[in-house]
Interface confidence: medium
């Protein structure tokens, strides 16, 4: 991937809109198609004011952990869908798109150097465990995906890209 491609806001926005589109096709989070078992996902809540004061290294850890758990969650949803009797085609398409999107975003973050931030020296305090929650519908899963991208990921890339511009 070209260096700093993720710093072009249109790139991240494309993935966010894809995730929101997926949320919309699942016909609402109350009555939409359910997952046959609950899936653990990252808690997307962002305390904006606290986040703004965090070191970029701490932000990177939260983003990387979240992205990793989200990828696992969507792969798990894909497996559950494959095992169902008649998986809706549109749902499969959006799950596939989400998996592809997360892989691309992971590559883009690597290029940005997000992984370097994870190599903390031995004397540093270990990061707080990632807050998680469980979801029981595809709609909620896609909502978490969209919220994670436009929350922590967008804030983190915005900060790193701004620093790179200085």
């Amino acid at each position: 991937a070209p260096p700093r491609l993720i710093c072009d806001s249109r790139v991240l926005e494309r993935y966010i809109l894809e995730a929101k589109e997926a949320e919309n096709v699942t016909m609402g989070c109350a009555e939409g198609p359910r997952l046959s078992e609950n899936i653990t996902v990252p808690d997307t809540k962002v305390n904006f004011y606290a986040w703004k004061r965090m070191e970029v290294e701490e932000q990177a850890i939260e983003v990387w952990q979240g992205l990793s758990l989200l990828s696992e969650a969507i792969l798990q949803a894909q497996a559950l869908l494959a095992n169902s009797s008649q998986p809706p085609e549109t749902l499969q398409l959006h799950i596939d798109k989400a998996i592809s999107g997360l892989r691309s975003l992971t590559s883009l973050l690597r290029v940005l150097g997000a992984q370097k931030e994870l190599m903390s020296p031995p004397d540093t305090t270990p990061p707080a465990p990632l807050r998680t929650l469980t979801v029981d519908t595809f709609c909620k899963l896609f909502r978490v995906y969209a919220n994670f991208l436009r929350g922590k990921l967008k804030l983190y890339t915005g900060e790193v890209c701004r620093r790179g511009d200085r």
Partner: antibody, heavy 127, light 108 residues
Framework: QVQLQQSGPGLVKPSQTLSLTCAIS??????????WNWIRQSPSRGLEWLGV?????????DYAVSVKSRITINPDTSKNQFSLQLNSVTPEDTAVYYC?????????????????WGRGTLVTVSS | SYVLTQPPSVSVAPGKTARITCSGD??????VEWYQQKPGQAPVLVIY???DRPSGIPERFSGSNSGNTATLTISRVEAGDEADYYC??????????FGGGTKLTVLG
Amino acid sequence: QVQLQQSGPGLVKPSQTLSLTCAISGDSVSSNTAAWNWIRQSPSRGLEWLGVIYYRSKWYNDYAVSVKSRITINPDTSKNQFSLQLNSVTPEDTAVYYCARSVPGGDPGLEHAFAYWGRGTLVTVSS
Amino acid sequence: SYVLTQPPSVSVAPGKTARITCSGDNLGTYYVEWYQQKPGQAPVLVIYDDSDRPSGIPERFSGSNSGNTATLTISRVEAGDEADYYCASFASWSDSVFGGGTKLTVLG
């Protein structure tokens, strides 16, 4: 139930300083889970967010770009209130000024939502 | 600076559904709030995070946000819903941006 009570003069002369105070009941200005904002509303500019202060083991503030060079928001912990000072005012600053509380750390967007508002103070800038 | 655009007015008959739009460049990637303001009063938060309702706000109020447009939907409109409605978003690092407002008129 959080309540915000505003006070301050309704008339300010051009080039002078506009000063308003917002007294808080039902919460603390130095709460670690709240943020305290000033917002104004005028027919020409509509609703306009001016700035925020919040306490997270120390005090922080953020100001709107449009007023950054003229604005100060300060807490007064002894009186559980916060104030707005806007310097070098012009007739363009004539507006209804509101104080408002937002609650960081809620659902993804709620931290920016203004859930509690003062009643508003009409401030006229005129000689 | 970021701009949110709303129609100046929307009219609806009682019992019908009102839809108020708010548009901005790629608005779907930001969180949107909606405020209701009646004459002489401070705004009241009716929707936050695109579609969530604070406690005390009737279920008749709902929101959505996708692409370039956020929509506030008020179903089974009542006379008491007549007010100005403002969308808002934290579209930049520290500034909150408000739309220009939409006057909702309940006919009859």
